[in-house]
Amino acid sequence: ECRPGMICATSATNSCARCVPYPICAAETVTKPQDMAEKDTTFEAPPLGTQPDCNPTPENGEAPASTSPTQSLLVDSQASKTLPIPTSAPVALSSTGK
């Protein structure tokens, strides 16, 4: 199993062959310190890779690394924009699996 903050990018039937950092960081609210702005507090999504959940170090999952060249996950152009904060909480989903 990949570490938290990682995702399996290549997998066999029952195991992960290659873990990569999960490429989408969850947006969080960031507020200005109280002494900087009392009324004009702003809320911004953090830059990519700044959260513990988005470890930028490649190939550091617990699963064995693949010997083949790795395919990097690329960020679309939308990612550079300031993004709205999602209002819905993460949803844990269950599956019967295979």
């Epitope: 199993e1 990949c2 570490r3 938290p4 990682m6 995702i7 399996c8 997998s11 066999a12 039937t13 029952n14 195991s15 992960c16 873990c19 999960y22 989408i24 969850a26 947006a27 959940d53 699963a63 679309d76 939308q78 990612a79 993004l83 709205p84 904060i85 999602p86 819905s88 909480a89 993460p90 949803v91 844990a92 989903l93 599956s95 019967t96 699996g97 295979k98």
Partner: nanobody, 122 residues
């Protein structure tokens, strides 16, 4: 139990296009990220693309600039537009819900739906 139904696959010539759809039921669709994975015969299951709840999109480099992922939360559907298809894109395509949670453990192809076959001939 989460249920997903993938559709839109088919057989096309190289350079052709397809639109894949993944319709979800039994969970709140606008919450989690959604991902597309694919698996060619005899090959591993590989991550293709992810779309976040707020619309940010990510692609593996082999499909960057050719594939586009989008979602319609009102219709509980996520789409994958496949353009400039190549024979190496031939695979069964699967969508996966909330990959941040569900695809850490490994195999993420076919756990939630039957997939849809894409065949690209040269």
């Amino acid at each position: 139990e989460v249920q997903l139904v993938e559709s839109g696959g088919g057989s096309v010539q190289a350079g052709g296009s397809l639109r894949l759809s993944c319709t979800a039921s039994r969970f709140t669709f606008d919450g989690p990220d959604m991902a597309w994975y694919r698996q060619a015969p005899g090959n591993a299951c590989e991550l293709v693309s992810i779309i976040s709840a707020d619309g940010r999109t990510y692609y593996t480099d082999s499909v960057k600039g050719r594939f586009t992922i989008s979602r319609d939360n009102a219709k509980n559907t996520v789409f994958l537009y496949l353009n400039s298809l190549q024979p190496e894109d031939t695979a069964v395509y699967y969508c996966a819900p909330d990959p941040r949670r569900n695809c850490r453990g490994g195999y993420c192809c076919g756990n939630w739906g039957p997939g849809t076959q894409v065949t690209v001939s040269s």
